[in-house]
Amino acid sequence: PQIFNKSNDGFTTTRSYGTVCPKDWEFYQARCFFLSTSESSWNESRDFCKGKGSTLAIVNTPEKLKFLQDITDAEKYFIGLIYHREEKRWRWINNSVFNGNVTNQNQNFNCATIGLTKTFDAASCDISYRRICEKNAK
């Protein structure tokens, strides 16, 4: 099991890996994740994460999805998954292709959330949801 201890410099360290995440960020597999409690549109969420030196989370493994679902408090969180309408394909914001399934698809739902269900859910990009930011652990 991971052992976390709070240091005085605003970072959370994991003794098992010697890696560091900022205060209030969660560590998983050499990455740091921030789950916001405030809500905003997808565009604002993207800018919010960018302002923290991170991106919206790219949840590209089942293990990462399970880890995040376990800590999402049954709320909807925007992630870095967007619909390429002309291509008719979902891609992560790093442009890698998404090979899974997105539920709740709708002509006007070009963004995606996780958290409330066990799946990736299509969502309106303009509605305000919480967001998950991701960056490398130091």
Epitope: T55, E86, V97, N110
Partner: antibody, heavy 125, light 112 residues
Framework: QQQLEESGGGLVKPGGTLTLTCTAS?????????MCWVRQAPGKGLELIAC????????WYATWVNGRFTISRSTSLNTVDLKMTSLTAADTATYFC?????????????????WGPGTLVTVSS | DIVMTQTPASVEAGVGGTVTIKCQAS??????LAWYQQKAGQRPKLLIY???TLASGVPSRFKGSGSGTEYTLTISGVQPDDAATYYC??????????????FGGGTEVVVK
């Protein structure tokens, strides 16, 4: 049929300015596309210059551009322009217009699935 | 920036033979890779995207494979019409904020 056609190429003196135009037909700029300019010097490889998101006008430039080139678009005319200033012999190349799919809000892109035939720019005194 | 290293620069093949072109990325690009064919004096043509998906209308003798940092384009049963220069292109964006697509240096395929 979806097509791209470049125009505006030709001979220009060093230090001069030239504007290239890419005219798109068969699809609308109100959709989610990145429109880009790619160049190819004689006998050399492909080099990405700049891109613009068709619907919002959000732009991206290669780091080496250093403000010499400006990309813009007209949604009413379905055109993309590349204004090139302070041209040197090293800018001599065939300039291609290329289109990529884009994600919501222009926050994603992919491969180039549509290319124009290219227009030749020669910088020489 | 991610650097794409393409090898070899040139390769010769007989009709009916097999050509293998490699493209190496300076970091993991998660299969965000396309291959293009460019014949002399013509525009590039998309062959393969997402490392292995054949573009519409492209013959099945073209095959893309690979993952991580190593990618390969294989042309089986080479035809005279395959004489061209082939380019790989990365479109992975590790920052999620820019364009940053990079092309490999190209491989010239000469058909004997």
């Amino acid at each position: 049929q979806q097509q791209l056609e470049e125009s505006g190429g030709g001979l220009v003196k060093p230090g001069g300015t030239l504007t290239l135009t890419c005219t798109a037909s068969g699809f609308s700029f109100s959709s989610s596309y990145y429109m880009c300019w790619v160049r190819q010097a004689p006998g050399k490889g492909l080099e990405l210059i700049a891109c613009i998101y068709s619907s919002s006008g959000r732009t991206w430039y290669a780091t080496w551009v250093n403000g010499r080139f400006t990309i813009s678009r007209s949604t009413s005319l379905n055109t993309v322009d590349l204004k090139m200033t302070s041209l040197t012999a090293a800018d001599t190349a065939t300039y291609f217009c290329a289109r990529s799919y884009a994600g919501y809000g222009g926050y994603g892109y992919a491969y180039f699935n549509l290319w124009g035939p290219g227009t030749l720019v020669t910088v020489s005194s | 920036d991610i650097v794409m290293t393409q090898t070899p620069a040139s390769v010769e093949a007989g009709v009916g033979g097999t050509v293998t072109i490699k493209c190496q990325a300076s970091e993991d690009i998660y299969s965000s890779l396309a291959w293009y064919q460019q014949k002399a004096g013509q525009r590039p043509k998309l062959l393969i995207y997402d490392a292995s998906t054949l573009a519409s209308g492209v013959p099945s003798r073209f095959k893309g494979s690979g993952s991580g940092t190593e990618y390969t384009l294989t042309i089986s049963g080479v035809q005279p019409d395959d004489a061209a220069t082939y380019y790989c292109q990365n479109y992975y964006d590790s920052t999620g904020s820019g364009y940053g697509a990079a092309f490999g240096g190209g491989t010239e395929v000469v058909v004997k």
